[in-house]
């Protein structure tokens, strides 16, 4: 089936926005006013995954770029990266597992759990302008809760 996608931005629970930091990295920082135009717009695609009544599998691409967030092992540690793909073949309904995140909604906040690495989540640091990463803890120092803003 044709994959259904929507455009959105994400902010962490501290209201930090996500921006590009170099060609293959995202960072989280507070933005205001015109600077908000720097934030990345995601193309969130609803894909096949181990869907449950609480978890919706999605892929997170960067709008108008052939880049997707993916989860891989680097030095034996689950790691978040931006991966370049062939735009002729992506997005697709049947994404490879490394591209899939389980979108979990709790109390109007969203978490994004890696399908490849259960219990690892898209995370930001408390500190400003630090890279977005894959973290293995919830409810600790690092932030795993996000809000989503729809973009037309």
């Amino acid at each position: 089936a044709p994959v259904r996608s929507l455009h959105c931005t994400l902010r962490d629970a501290q209201l930090k926005s996500l921006v590009m930091s170099g060609p293959y990295e995202l960072k989280a920082l507070h933005l205001q006013g015109q600077d908000l135009e720097q934030q990345v717009v995601f193309s969130m695609s609803f894909v096949q995954g181990e869907e449950s009544n609480d978890k919706i599998p999605v892929a997170l691409g960067l709008k108008a770029k052939n880049l997707y967030l993916s989860c891989v092992l680097k030095d034996d540690k689950p790691t978040l990266q931006l991966e370049s793909v062939d735009p002729k073949n992506y997005p697709k309904k049947k994404m490879e597992k490394r591209f899939v995140f389980n979108k979990i909604e709790i109390n109007n906040k969203l978490e994004f759990e890696s399908a490849q690495f259960p219990n690892w989540y898209i995370s930001t640091s408390q500190a400003e302008s630090m890279p977005v990463f894959l973290g293995g803890t919830r409810g600790g120092q690092d932030i795993t809760d996000f809000t989503m803003q729809f973009v037309s």
Partner: antibody, heavy 122, light 107 residues
Framework: EVQLQESGPGLVKPSETLSLTCTVS????????VSWIRQPPGKGLEWLGL???????YYNSPLKSRLTISKDNSKSQVSLKLSSVTAADTAVYYC????????????????WGQGTLVTVSS | DTQMTQSPSSLSASVGDRVTITCITS??????MNWYQQKPGKPPKLLIS???TLRPGVPSRFSSSGSGTDFTFTISSLQPEDFATYYC?????????FGQGTKLEIK
Amino acid sequence: EVQLQESGPGLVKPSETLSLTCTVSGFSLSDYGVSWIRQPPGKGLEWLGLIWGGGDTYYNSPLKSRLTISKDNSKSQVSLKLSSVTAADTAVYYCAKQRTLWGYDLYGMDYWGQGTLVTVSS
Amino acid sequence: DTQMTQSPSSLSASVGDRVTITCITSTDIDVDMNWYQQKPGKPPKLLISQGNTLRPGVPSRFSSSGSGTDFTFTISSLQPEDFATYYCLQSDNLPLTFGQGTKLEIK
């Protein structure tokens, strides 16, 4: 060789809870999902829900409030519990293995158990 | 949810006949259609999995075609052991949904 076998009481009283077990061999429950399907006598197939390798569950909406699927990986067993049963829940209940092939066929079902008939009657 | 419309609900045919069953889905499911055969007192047996793929050990007289919303299952030359009930199943999205079944009887 992949095998699934359903077991449980063949007779359940109305308003009680129907409990079934699916014992599997030839594959690991931590790697593959298992679905439950039922078939009322002389009727078609109805998909009830599934449990994934990681333990997450998906329940079909009409039964969501009454259905619980759980598993014990070490015993290679998946269980189904359906509460507050009525005569309409009389059916042959099947468990089936999901293909769970990422990027190809995640949701298809390839191997089925023989099924067990459950009658709801007082 | 994806609704399935399978037809006909029953069919009488003779050994050697060519038989066709159709399944129409309410949403585009790409090629994620499966076909099962069920005999009385037995569980359904997967004949053809998504992508119109014949399962190992299934005779080549069984075939399927289609993508999107329109799907066809064909038995090219009916054999006595083929008289059974056939079901389509979409595996594109949850909840999984079956067609109503086609009972194939001897004419």
